[in-house]
C-alpha cells in the first residue's frame, strides 16, 4: 500500500520562516501534489500550493517557493509577515494524485515539542568581560 | 494504559462526508502508530488507514479501497486523531474502531497484534 509523509521544520534562526516537506512512497508517477493548510481536502483546508511535473507550481501566500525535490517529493517554504507566528499549531497536508494508485493525502504539523510557545526559554549566554 | 474514544459517527447520505475523532487519554506517551479499522455488518474487522509519528515526520498509509476518499491526520499535541471521510458509499457503512499499533504493525495482518481499541462508533451511509 502506498504511503506519504510530511515533514513540518521551523526554521531555527528565524521563528517565522518554515519548510513543509512531502514525500509519496509507493509505484506510480505522480501526476499532481496539492498543499494545504488548516486541515485536509474536504475539512476546511487552504490551498497553498499546486505542483504539476509538466505544468509548473503556483503558490498562494504565505507560500514563499514551492518545488519538487525529487520525482516523488515536494517542499514548500513559508513566511509569516506577523510578529508570531500561527504556523507552529497548524495542520498541513499534502495530496498526491498518481497514476493508477489515486490520490493519497497524509497531514503533519509541527512536532509539540518544537512549538515555541511550550518549550522551554532559551539559556541566557553569560557576557565575559575583561577588566 | 491507553484508553481510546471515538466519536464523529452518524447518519449520512451517500456522497456525504463525516469527521471522526478519537481521544486518546492515559499512556498517551505510547502514541506513535495510531490507526482506523472498521467493521461492516456479518464482515470481519478491516484496516483503514494508520499514522505514524518519527521525530518531525508523520507517515500515512491506508487500504487500498480508500482511494483518496479518506484522510488520515492528527493532533499530537491534543493526542487527538481524526478520520475525515468524504464521496461515502453505502458500503462505507460499518463501525470504525480507533486503534493504537505496534511500531512495526503490518497492515496485512488486519486487526491481529494491535495494542488497544476504541469501543467503535457507527457510520451509516444511505443511497
Known amino acids: 500500500t502506498p504511503e506519504v509523509w510530511v515533514q513540518v521544520q521551523m526554521e531555527a534562526t528565524e521563528l517565522s520562516s518554515f519548510t513543509v516537506h512531502c514525500g509519496f512512497l509507493g509505484p506510480g508517477s505522480i501526476s499532481l501534489v496539492t498543499v494545504s493548510w488548516g486541515g485536509p481536502d474536504g475539512a476546511g483546508g487552504t490551498k497553498l500550493a499546486v505542483l504539476h511535473p509538466e505544468l509548473g507550481t503556483r503558490q498562494w501566500a504565505p507560500a514563499r517557493q514551492a518545488r519538487w525535490e525529487t520525482q516523488s517529493s515536494i517542499s514548500l517554504a513559508l513566511e509569516d509577515s506577523g510578529a508570531s507566528s500561527p504556523f507552529a499549531n497548524t495542520t498541513f497536508c499534502c495530496k498526491f494524485a498518481s497514476f493508477p494508485e489515486g490520490s493519497w493525502e497524509s497531514c503533519g504539523s509541527l512536532p509539540p515539542s518544537s512549538d515555541p510557545g511550550l518549550s522551554a526559554p532559551p539559556t541566557p549566554v553569560p557576557i565575559l568581560r575583561a577588566d | 494504559q491507553l484508553q481510546l474514544v471515538e466519536s464523529g459517527g452518524g447518519l449520512v447520505q451517500s456522497g456525504g462526508s463525516l469527521r471522526l475523532s478519537c481521544a486518546a487519554s492515559?499512556?498517551?506517551?505510547?502514541?506513535?502508530?495510531m490507526g482506523w479499522f472498521r467493521q461492516a455488518p456479518g464482515k470481519e474487522r478491516e484496516f483503514v488507514g494508520r499514522?505514524?509519528?518519527?521525530?518531525?515526520?508523520?507517515?500515512?498509509s491506508y487500504a487500498d479501497f480508500v482511494k483518496g476518499r479518506f484522510t488520515l491526520y492528527g493532533n499530537q499535541a491534543r493526542n487527538t486523531v481524526y478520520l475525515q471521510m468524504n464521496s461515502l458509499k453505502p458500503e462505507d457503512t460499518a463501525v470504525y474502531y480507533c486503534a493504537a499499533l505496534p511500531s512495526d504493525y503490518d497492515y496485512r495482518a488486519a486487526s491481529y497484534g494491535v495494542d488497544y481499541w476504541g469501543k467503535g462508533t457507527l457510520v451509516t451511509v444511505s443511497s
Open positions: 492515559g499512556r498517551t506517551r505510547s502514541m506513535y502508530v
Open positions: 499514522i505514524k509519528w518519527s521525530g518531525d515526520t508523520t507517515y500515512t
